[in-house]
Interface confidence: low
């Protein structure tokens, strides 16, 4: 539906508050180094302009596309070339190439200082002085560090943040109230970030068809009572709005997301019996709630899949005449029966089914050829099930920190060329799968584990793409998204790697480590573990455990000492020497 003024249309649909938030996110995700104040100035100018267009849609420039309007704003920044170098070259291009150029310059790992949370008193003071500015800073800081964060969802997290501040700033012990709540919010937001990045990667690398298949599988699991046409409609709409958000079209994305939520709530009867509680909420909470809604109960008496997809005499005819529709119905029917499978596994099964039909339908007796296709799924199903079982057992035995360390060793041996910070981040995140998924009932473990790991490995791939260093990682990252996790799991120790030369300073620590929070202390120790494996990639588990144990004891001893620095400089070299000997 054409509107005379796109910007007026979006302003009216979204309302001023959400409009301003989304424009701020958009600018922060494109120009990640600009200070907050500079972005706010741009946001206010765009908002004032939108208001003039709402008043008169025929006013000058109101008919311009959002890409043109936003791009012109960015390109008008006088310091653009000084701050961003070659990104300024985008401004010489015409739309849509200019917008594509901006997108290419988004940096998944911007060189920004880690965000340090101020103390509770200071936060409450600034929140109470100006809540709008306080929340604006939050949107800006998250968006610039996570340039693909799902914008309407970031508005939801900002709302949650604001509610926490409102609640806790009235408490006597503000810190005790704020800290655990914001820690939990941060965990959720980071998980949301890696999940959205996987969606954007899937769209960028493999296009709409691949993402739509993911959406069909996920929606079919969630809404097994909905018919295929309904699932297709939902998947199509979700694909469109996800593409918009990944493409930086945040106003359209947020508007379409609200529309999709409205549609789902108006058509609950043909979608799911679990939506009502979500549908009673305001727009941001409603969309968030719908995205996390539990799977509906399976319909009773679902017929065997074999009837339509193996035994039917017209399988090859149906496949040949409408491949995507036929494979779509297969994926739908399989997924709705298997909420206990990961989406990645369901897509691998659909791919196997497609490959089998491609081969068999060209043969003299197709049904004899594809007759056992469903049995041939067994190894594909067993592989991730075994992975979940083994890893959850290891997690239960070692606890989260120990499990992370086991993963550090495993992944450093697979890809020792990858930077130490990336390996530590990846292993720590992969290690969180234990407390996130292994605690769930059996039927929910596999989808939780594999789909979570897929998102974390995508982050590894995105960072590795920027500076490729490992052929093994490149091999797994350039293949299909659904094959990534099995590919990484199957990677052997990299035999081509030349061990890193031993440098004593890598393992030299000082008293400042003692004052770090426990999490950061762990990360320092884990970085040392990565370096140990890079130095001795063939070191055995017991050897590494011994060294790590001695290292932990050394830290405990020196951090309790009267003269900490003296202890570090006296015992440190001894530890380094004994570690070298233990690994010889």
């Amino acid at each position: 539906d054409a509107h005379k003024s796109e910007i007026a249309h979006r302003f009216k649909d979204l309302g001023e508050q959400h409009f301003k938030g989304l424009v701020l996110i958009a600018f922060s995700q494109f120009l990640q180094k600009c200070p907050y104040e500079e972005h706010v100035k741009l946001v206010n100018e765009v908002t004032d302009f939108a208001k003039t267009c709402v008043a008169d849609e025929s006013a000058e420039n109101c008919d311009k596309s959002l890409h043109t309007l936003f791009g012109d704003k960015l390109c008008a920044i006088p310091t653009l070339r000084d701050s961003y170098g070659e990104l300024a070259d985008c401004c010489a291009k015409k739309e849509p190439e200019r917008n594509e150029c901006f997108l290419k310059h988004k940096d998944d790992h911007p060189n920004l200082p880690p965000f340090v949370r101020p103390d509770a008193e200071a936060m409450c003071t600034s929140f109470q002085e100006n809540a709008v500015t306080f929340m604006g800073h939050y949107l800006h800081e998250v968006a610039r560090r996570h340039p693909y964060f799902y914008a309407p969802e970031l508005l939801y997290y900002a709302e949650k943040y604001s509610a926490i501040m409102t609640e806790c700033c009235g408490e006597a012990d503000k810190a005790a109230c704020i800290t655990p709540k914001l820690d939990a919010l941060k965990e959720k937001a980071l998980a949301s970030s890696v999940n959205q990045r996987l969606k954007c990667s899937s769209l960028q690398r493999f296009g709409q068809r691949a993402f739509k298949a993911w959406a069909v599988a996920r929606m079919s699991q969630k809404f097994p009572k909905a018919d295929f046409a309904e699932i297709t409609k939902l998947a199509t709409d979700l694909t469109k709005l996800t593409e918009e958000c990944c493409h930086g079209d945040l106003l359209e994305c947020a508007d379409d997301r609200a529309e999709l939520a409205k549609y789902m709530c108006e058509n609950q009867a043909s979608i799911s019996s679990k939506l009502q509680a979500c549908c009673d909420k305001p727009v941001l909470k409603k969309s968030h709630c719908l995205s996390e809604v539990e799977n509906d109960d399976l319909p009773a008496d679902l017929p065997s899949l074999a009837a339509d997809f193996v035994e039917d005499k017209e399988v090859c005819k149906n496949y040949a005449e409408a491949k995507d529709v036929f494979l779509g119905t297969f994926l739908y029917e399989y997924a709705r029966r298997h909420p206990d499978y990961s989406v990645a596994l369901l897509l691998r099964l659909a791919k196997k089914y497609e490959a089998t039909l491609e081969k068999c339908c060209a043969e003299a007796d197709p049904s004899a050829c594809y007759g056992k296709v469903l049995d041939e799924f067994q190894p594909l199903v067993e592989e991730p099930k075994n992975l979940v079982k083994a890893n959850c057992e290891l997690f239960e035995k070692l606890g989260e920190y120990g499990f992370q360390n086991a993963l550090i060793v495993r992944y450093t041996q697979k890809a020792p060329q990858v930077s130490t910070p990336t390996l530590v981040e990846a292993a720590r995140n992969l290690g969180k799968v234990g407390s996130k998924c292994c605690v769930l009932p059996e039927a929910q473990r596999l989808p939780c584990v594999e789909d979570y790991i897929s998102a974390i490995l995508n982050r590894v791939c995105v960072l590795h793409e920027k500076t490729p260093v490992s052929e093994q990682v490149t091999k797994c990252c350039t293949g299909s998204v659904v094959e990534r996790r099995p590919c990484f799991s199957a990677l052997p120790v990299d035999e081509t790697y030349v061990p890193k030369e031993f440098k004593a300073e890598t393992f030299t620590f000082h008293a400042d480590i003692c004052s770090l929070p426990e999490k950061e202390k762990q990360m320092k120790k884990q970085a040392a573990l990565v370096e140990l494996v890079k130095h001795k990639p063939k070191a055995t588990g017991p050897q590494l455990r011994t060294v790590l144990g001695e290292f932990t004891a050394f830290l405990d001893k020196c951090c309790k000492a009267e003269d900490k620095e003296a202890c570090f400089s006296e015992d440190g070299p001894k530890l380094v020497a004994s570690s070298q000997a233990a690994l010889a």
């Epitope: 046409a229 297709t232 005449e321 036929f326 119905t329």
Partner: nanobody, 114 residues
Framework: QVQLQESGGGLVQPGGSLRLTCTAS????????MSWVRQAPGKGLEWVSA????????RYADSVKGRFTISRDNGKKMLTLDMNSLKPEDTAVYYC???????ASQGTQVTVSS
């Protein structure tokens, strides 16, 4: 090739009845919700009625409620629209469509006139 073939249209007097049928091929009919839509001369497309894949859920536009009945036979891959108490404003080309999709067939002409 997905194919939908409508039939049963014709000229009928106001108050009369018609039965439209749609025969489907080239896709797994029983997995899809289906709809009837219509287009009157010089007007846009208007949704008329929809039915879920298993036939349990039926929906109607306010303008046809109580007069039209949608049904399906998954074994025969057939969709039906029974139209009673027809009015001149029901005059249009009627199309059957998959889900809530756009017409991809010829349709069948229904003319209600005395």
């Amino acid at each position: 090739q997905v194919q939908l073939q409508e039939s049963g249209g014709g000229l009928v007097q106001p108050g009369g009845s018609l039965r439209l049928t749609c025969t489907a091929s080239g896709f797994t009919f029983r997995s899809f919700g289906m709809s009837w839509v219509r287009q009157a001369p010089g007007k846009g497309l208007e949704w008329v009625s929809a039915i879920s894949a298993d036939g349990s859920d039926k929906r109607y536009a306010d303008s046809v409620k109580g007069r039209f009945t949608i049904s399906r036979d998954n074994g025969k891959k057939m969709l039906t629209l029974d139209m009673n108490s027809l009015k001149p404003e029901d005059t249009a080309v009627y199309y059957c469509v998959i889900g809530r999709g756009s017409p991809a067939s010829q349709g069948t002409q229904v003319t209600v006139s005395s």
